[in-house]
Amino acid sequence: SCNTATCVTHRLAGLLSRSGGVVKDNFVPTNVGSEAF
């Protein structure tokens, strides 16, 4: 699976979209990082 910064950002955007934006405030690309995926 792709763990570049850009992949992480797009994947997170998808997760946010599917959750309706109901996630923790710190759930952002630079905090989550590639290790989360």
Epitope: C2, T4, A5, T6, C7, T9, H10, L12, A13, L16, V28, P29, T30, N31, G33
Partner: antibody
Framework: EVQLVQSGAEVKKPGASVKVSCKAS????????MNWVRQAPGQRLEWIGD????????TYNQKFKGRATLTVDKSASTAYMELSSLRSEDTAVYYC????????????WGQGTTVTVSS | DIQMTQSPSSVSASVGDRVTITCKAS??????VAWYQQKPGKSPKALIY???YRYSGVPSRFSGSGSGTDFTLTISSLQPEDFATYYC?????????FGGGTKVEIK
């Protein structure tokens, strides 16, 4: 409104260094990675590297490792790209770019900074 | 590094034409491809991410497809403002790399 505003054009001599700035506004600067890309006249786009503004962790294109240095000033919401040991082939337009999710999911680019290396 | 080979390097077309640009990666990049439009003297403008998803505000005449090594950008009905150079980019692995560009010119 998300904006990435870059510093002005530079003319440098071979062997010198240049530092380009990119001031971000309209979003939380530390939440999103900042990329740097360049484009020499008539050439394809070339990725230099990216930086996590939150941690300062960088990833570089090996082609530029040792010559390019990416940094941020979190308090000023500004990213910097410094390129050393300049040569004529470094003459290019340098761009900062960041993919933002909030407030608008989009891939934003700065207006570009022209760096000319000439003796 | 992954090479991204775009074709054609230029295409002459008329308003209303359907234009197809292809991009071939030298190795599997999944669906991790973006497309950009660039006009002379301007910054690149993002059109497509993840091979087939349009960014908000991008007209529906632009569509992307493909996965693995073969990708396509299609402009279904060319408009006057679409005359520009188009680049593909892979972001599946570092360093990110771009195609050589396709210039869409007025016939």
């Amino acid at each position: 409104e998300v904006q990435l505003v870059q510093s002005g054009a530079e003319v440098k001599k071979p062997g010198a260094s240049v530092k380009v700035s990119c001031k971000a506004s309209g979003y939380t600067f530390t939440d999103y990675y900042m990329n740097w890309v360049r484009q020499a006249p008539g050439q394809r786009l070339e990725w230099i590297g990216d930086i996590n503004p939150n941690s300062g962790v960088t990833t570089y294109n090996q082609k530029f490792k040792g010559r390019a240095t990416l940094t941020v000033d979190k308090s000023a919401s500004t990213a910097y790209m410094e390129l050393s040991s300049l040569r004529s082939e470094d003459t290019a337009v340098y761009y900062c770019a960041s993919i933002i999710i909030v407030p608008d999911y989009f891939d934003y680019w700065g207006q570009g900074t022209t760096v000319t290396v000439s003796s | 590094d992954i090479q991204m080979t775009q074709s054609p390097s230029s295409v002459s077309a008329s308003v209303g034409d359907r234009v197809t640009i292809t991009c071939k990666a030298s190795q599997n990049v999944g669906s991790n491809v973006a497309w950009y439009q660039q006009k002379p003297g301007k910054s690149p403008k993002a059109l497509i991410y993840s091979a087939s998803y349009r960014y908000s505000g991008v007209p529906s005449r632009f569509s992307g497809s493909g996965s693995g090594t073969d990708f396509t950008l299609t402009i279904s009905s060319l408009q006057p403002e679409d005359f520009a150079t188009y680049y593909c980019q892979q972001y599946n692995s570092y360093p990110y790399t771009f195609g050589g560009g396709t210039k869409v010119e007025i016939k």
